[in-house]
């Protein structure tokens, strides 16, 4: 039973590699998936000596480890690329690193933008 689920229909979109991949750089993404499957938003980023470099944001297909996550929180200690996923429209706007071994929680706030809608 999926009791606490927040339906995800739209996510913040970003692609640092947009020129090479011939996509938009940023905006909103409408999520599409198979019937009866849940959808999520995600964010991925690098942290080079405290400087945050966004990699990608967007929709994420049904993934059980994303269920019931209202906030986008990465917990891996020191990966090459940080990853988080969540449920609920635009839940990937803000993202957080909360390392498993303790340490400080770091939340990344997006700069204000006027996003374009991607379909």
């Amino acid at each position: 039973s999926g009791r606490g689920e927040a339906e995800t229909r739209e996510c913040i979109y970003y692609n640092a590699n947009w020129e090479l991949e011939r996509t938009n750089q940023s905006g909103l993404e409408r999520c599409e998936g198979e019937q009866d499957k849940r959808l999520h938003c995600y964010a991925s980023w690098r942290n080079s000596s405290g400087t945050i470099e966004l990699v990608k944001k967007g929709c994420w297909l049904d993934d059980f480890n994303c269920y019931d996550r209202q906030e986008c929180v990465a917990t891996e200690e020191n990966p090459q690329v940080y990853f988080c996923c969540c449920e609920g429209n635009f839940c990937n706007e803000r993202f957080t690193h909360l390392p498993e071994a303790g340490g400080p929680e770091v939340t990344y706030e997006p700069p204000p933008t006027a996003p374009t809608l991607l379909t």
Partner: antibody, heavy 118, light 110 residues
Amino acid sequence: EVQLLESGGGLVQPGGSLRLSCAASGFTFRNSAMSWVRQAPGKGLEWVSAISVTGGSTYYTDSVKGRFTVSRDNSRNTLYLQMNSLRAEDTAVYYCAKVYYYSFFDYWGQGTLVTVSS
Amino acid sequence: QTVVTQEPSFSVSPGGTVTLTCGFNSGSVSTSYYPSWYQQTPGQAPRTLIYNTNTRSSGVPDRFSGSILGNKAALTITGAQADDESDYYCVLYMGSGIHVFGGGTKLTVL
């Protein structure tokens, strides 16, 4: 180091109940979805149940629906499987497993044996 | 009811290459099912080999690789060794919380 330690297995009569526990350490339990997988003697692995990070979403294989209940206590870093109306065909080693992104089992416990017999 | 199928048994010579497959009865396996592979020796807990179709788990030698072959997920072992003799299981994630194991393949190295 990630550790998953199951307990609570044993011999029980058909129709009886057992509660399995899985004590987790070495990772942030409240941030991980979890699952139970079982293996009958001489048989293959079978997924039994899964529970989301908050416990708000729970899922079961058809053969245990209505008889088994999965739950978690994030303050105690413990996963549970309450098994009621047990049948001979529930006899198996029960493993708890941590579920990671891409919905795979990245860590496994050593298992606890449940024997249902009269 | 989804049934995930694997070859019941397979033999490979030491140093040889073997490909185990994983399909299901309701269509083609794709990356959206996040195919994963596990190795199990008798009396031991399973060990994670491959996840997300083709990503090796930490500490798994690069002799093990995963892919999609046609309409199935595949696990390839190149340069098979005696201690690769084990049972191998694939898992497909069907969505909505449901994971389905294949019946397993008993691999013999001889």
